[in-house]
Amino acid sequence: SIPWNLERIIPAWHQTEEDRSPDGSSQVEVYLLDTSIQGAHREIEGRVTITDFNSVPEEDGTRFHRQASKCDSHGTHLAGVVSGRDAGVAKGTSLHSLRVLNCQGKGTVSGTLIGLEFIRKSQLIQPSGPLVVLLPLAGGYSRILNAACRHLARTGVVLVAAAGNFRDDACLYSPASAPEVITVGATNAQDQPVTLGTLGTNFGRCVDLFAPGKDIIGASSDCSTCFMSQSGTSQAAAHVAGIVARMLSREPTLTLAELRQRLIHFSTKDVINMAWFPEDQQVLTPNLVATLPPSTHETGGQLLCRTVWSAHSGPTRTATATARCAPEEELLSCSSFSRSGRRRGDWIEAIGGQQVCKALNAFGGEGVYAVARCCLVPRANCSIHNTPAARAGLETHVHCHQKDHVLTGCSFHWEVEDLSVRRQPALRSRRQPGQCVGHQAASVYASCCHAPGLECKIKEHGISGPSEQVTVACEAGWTLTGCNVLPGASLTLGAYSVDNLCVARVHDTARADRTSGEATVAAAICCRSRPSAKASWVQ
Amino acid sequence: QDEDGDYEELMLALPSQEDGLADEAAHVATATFRRCSKEAWRLPGTYIVVLMEETQRLQIEQTAHRLQTRAARRGYVIKVLHIFYDLFPGFLVKMSSDLLGLALKLPHVEYIEEDSFVFAQ
């Protein structure tokens, strides 16, 4: 009789875990910024501290009647989803509630900021174990709310936020759009995006993953033993906050970057029907449903990577897009994508001591995306080698010339606007191991890394006939670090990574006029980390 | 995720001199004013004044006080509702939108954001 949502996110081998661990043994603390809550509810009694924090706007309307059970409804349900005795994800976790939403579920950016500051002060006054902050709220894009989240995240706090229920791009809302926050969209029992009336879950590149958020049974504030179903991205975020709490209670030293990477890596993949999302958002939205990952002891030193999309560059001629990894992550490769195919490629550059992935729009293009592959590579030392464009008719080759450095990604950037020069040479010279082979008139950038036991290899797949996309996957045990379209057909839209799959996209019109000799090639660089081995390039 | 989304950023037209008052030497305002793109969610009259990252504790208080003093000279009463020290330097202020130009010219100010609603999801 386990509720569907818990069954979905907690694999069978974890389901008896609670009963083996002493109650309340976890030192993890979850802070919930929401409505007031009913602390005496059976689900959460004894695990919840209702702080004296209260920063809410007045309720609207002169005839508004404050009814305690209604005022507490949203927060009580979420507290139950996180740590409820019976329907909670992290049953032993202690929770602190801060009231930032009024009885109508409305709050302010300023009230939320003061709440976040309250948490920071508590942290300074009495340092404790790992902290998770659940933000089951959303407002319009706010630079300061995002900045506050960034500052708090940099103190080691893990923030989890609702993507929003506006059936819209999550990047238009805060705190959902803050990169340092784990942003969660909502799915139903069929693993499909949640519809809420005429609206539904938000989507897009600012969503990290999805979690159950429809008809979630949890504590009802109507009475101390009442239960009810609620739906929304708040419920989804509460599931992920619970998962994070469980991960941290097992391994308190996990960092935000490790937590996010593990959540992504161990999530259920490709079950969401992407057709629900607007067409232009489908490629940007992660097809991931959260599940509780195994501990790092059980999974060894896997190489973990995720794909980070930039904002759209906009259509101006010199528009650039920038994708960034989290501070702890290594940028192992950079690619670009444009729906019109008019792009001048991508490159990696250092900005303020951090490597960033850049993409450049071309004249007449509708804009580009930069696509960064961000990885956790312990003790990595990475650098970029680039070669200016070669003379017409020649290819450019770049390889990793430092000892024990392996190639993890290639980028190509054209100095010229004329797309027609990017023709594949009649004969492509045989690729040397660990080399980036450039298109004509392209500057080539090689991402080279040294890390204990890091080994990489290239995998190519070419299609000569008509095809909208070419894909190549890294096999089990290997992780995709780089993905490119190799000097190929007349017009490619670009390349990007979806989990362990490298996708090279071709323009529809380019398919018809392609000659059989012009194969579109998707090139994947696949790496793995074997701590005992030396860094090497595998042929 | 860090680019500004559908977000209003306004550079207010500012006079180079503040009513010619001697102690208020011209300060070129590089600070911007930001507000929610959804009009119904805006809370005009309440503003979060965000100061430069390295602003010291005392400077935060001085900036808030300076704003109060300069507003008073113009016949406006403003209320500092909260001072942010621990997460970022800044303060929350209740004031007329007429004073935004003045506030943006204060030293240490990086940007000012109009308060707005957030909602349970």
């Epitope: 509810h41 059976r42 004894g46 005795r85 019976d86 032993g92 101390s224 033993t225 009442c226 009810m228 | -």
Partner: antibody, heavy 118, light 107 residues
Amino acid sequence: QVQLVQSGAEVKKPGASVKVSCKASGYTFTSYYMHWVRQAPGQGLEWMGEINPSGGRTNYNEKFKSRVTMTRDTSTSTVYMELSSLRSEDTAVYYCARERPLHAMDYWGQGTTVTVSS
Amino acid sequence: DIQMTQSPSSLSASVGDRVTITCKASQDVHTAVAWYQQKPGKAPKLLIYSASHRYTGVPSRFSGSGSGTDFTFTISSLQPEDIATYYCQQRYSTPRTFGQGTKLEIK
């Protein structure tokens, strides 16, 4: 598996006290409330009170408030119900029952028969 | 205290019959109602929780419905092993109160 094992039958004189125990196993003892419910011969079920084993907090039915005491010993995962000033109408089967918040009283002890007779 | 009025107090039905028992609360109890089965000399067994949710391992012929003040318990096709006394119970507030029970017999 979850088990609640109660102490054996008791025969008491009017005015005396009885202390019934209920030993829990197969789950985290402090995570779930324990209730006491009694049933007089040929009658229905009557709720006496509850204890939260985590902190020891109790909540009694007004009817029994002056005579009942519920305690717990977390080291042995045992709860106790003591009823004082016994009278003949207290003759009943006394059950302990675990409450899972979502699932109500999902596990019950086998019952302890208390007979009050002079 | 919240009163739970159960009806009928006893009923006789044939194997295969559809049996319905009702329970009326003296005030709104949301969906915080459970149904139990008790066989002679045994402890009660949980069948339905939160008004309509079947507990683990309970056969699908048992169902519950209702919210607020009116609740119904149904056995869709009576089996010989279903002979017992059935109780409703409100979990909305303390003191917890039970209905007086419905004794079910086979015709």
